[in-house]
């Protein structure tokens, strides 16, 4: 028969022959022959291969460097790389999470719309009319102005996006 020019899925062509690829978590030791199957061996300690492959060496698991704000979210296996995430208060600078930066704080006049996670930064929004934030914070939302009326008080000083209203007693009409 004619030697193949293409092979099935999970196979590779070598010496005019289709050989089985090694499964994830295993590396290639020797190609198949007319008489023998592909020989594969499991990856070693701290190593992985995450695809069907013909690699002769496994990849080393990545290191989650605490000096870059990283910590282990899930340690690697023979089939998966280590997954890093960021320490509390930090988030990844990229999808690959190779380093972390401190969560940004929302300045006075802005509140937190979405609290940061290990992979996304704080999302801030300007405080709308009727709301204020007088602190720089990565957690605080905009707070509503105090309602003077419900306290039987009147507004003595209007609120801004950075300050609450100041309430005071109602002027008593003298008899």
């Amino acid at each position: 028969p004619e030697p193949p020019t293409a092979c099935r899925e999970k196979q590779y062509l070598i010496n005019s022959q289709c050989c089985s690829l090694c499964q994830p978590g295993q590396k290639l030791v020797s190609d198949c022959t007319e008489f023998t199957e592909t020989e594969c061996l499991p990856c070693g300690e701290s190593e992985f291969l995450d695809t069907w492959n013909r690699e002769t060496h496994c990849h080393q698991h990545k290191y989650c460097d605490p000096n870059l704000g990283l910590r282990v979210q899930q340690k690697g296996t023979s089939e998966t790389d280590t997954i890093c995430t960021c320490e509390e208060g930090w988030h990844c600078t990229s999808e690959a999470c190779e380093s972390c930066v401190l969560h940004r704080s929302c300045s006075p006049g802005f509140g937190v719309k979405q609290i940061a996670t290990g992979v996304s930064d704080t999302i801030c929004e300007p405080c709308p009319v009727g709301f204020f934030s007088n602190v720089s914070s990565a957690f605080e939302k905009c707070h509503p102005w105090t309602s003077c009326e419900t306290k039987d008080l009147v507004v003595q000083q209007a609120g801004t996006n950075k300050t609450d209203v100041v309430c005071g007693p109602q002027d008593r009409l003298r008899a």
Epitope: L41, P42, G44, E45, S46, E47, T56, H57, C58, Q60, H61, Y63, C64, D65, P66, R71, V72, K75, G76, T77, T82
Partner: antibody
């Protein structure tokens, strides 16, 4: 700070079993693979096997299969090595060493070793 | 199993002398680790992934190699370097150690 503390020396009779412990502090053993290594008097190091505390999966050197059993208790952050049907060949120092994924170095931390003496 | 053969088994060196210990693997390995052990103490990781010095290891130590041939070198022997050195491969289970090289001070 990472620390690995092993249980004290054991004097056991031939044919008996012994269970050694290895308690880690400064990290969660689920973020490590816990390994055990044997060293007979005046001899070299022999790898016994390891466990993944996250799921209990173990790997052993075939020559220790049936002799050694590695387990963990994640609630106490402890790994165990049970040795059965003891003979004089099992007289050795047994070390626990985690391959801890929060460390740049594999096998950077070792317990102080537990001496097992098999004698009648 | 991958067999690691260390040579020499025992050697002595004078202070200031260059020392080389070799580790030969029966099959190709991706990297080699080296451990130092002194009598009555636990082994210490000395060199990891072939050529990286572990924390606190003096710069006079170095590691190199690939495939089946690896070595640990001390550029200038010092008294504190007297110990037994073991190579260890992690590329294939079971993990294996060399039989050790005992380095003595002359």
């Amino acid at each position: 700070e990472v620390h690995v503390k092993q249980s004290g020396a054991e004097l056991v009779k031939p044919g008996a079993s012994v269970k050694l412990s290895c308690t880690a502090s400064g990290f969660n053993i689920k973020d490590a693979y816990m390994h055990w290594v044997k060293q007979r008097p005046e001899q070299g190091l022999e790898w016994i096997g390891r466990i993944d505390p996250a799921n209990g999966n173990t790997k052993y050197d075939p020559k220790f299969q049936g002799k050694a059993s590695i387990t963990t208790d994640t609630s106490s952050n402890t790994a165990y090595l049970q040795l059965s049907s003891l003979t004089s060949e099992d007289t050795a120092v047994y070390y626990c060493t985690p391959n801890y994924y929060g460390s740049r170095y594999p096998f950077a931390y070792w317990g102080q070793g537990t001496t097992v003496t098999v004698s009648s | 199993d991958i067999v690691l053969t260390q040579s020499p088994a025992i050697m002595s060196a004078s202070p200031g002398e260059k020392v080389s210990i070799t580790c030969s693997a029966s099959s190709s390995v991706s990297y080699m680790h080296w451990f130092q052990q002194k009598p009555g103490t636990s082994p210490k990781l000395w060199i990891y992934s072939t050529s990286n010095l572990a924390s606190g290891v003096p710069a006079r130590f170095s590691g190199s190699g690939s495939g089946t041939s690896y070595s640990l070198t001390i550029s200038r022997m010092e008294a504190d370097d007297a110990a037994t050195y073991y190579c260890q491969q992690g590329s294939s289970y079971p993990l294996t150690f060399g039989a050790g090289t005992k380095l003595e001070l002359k």
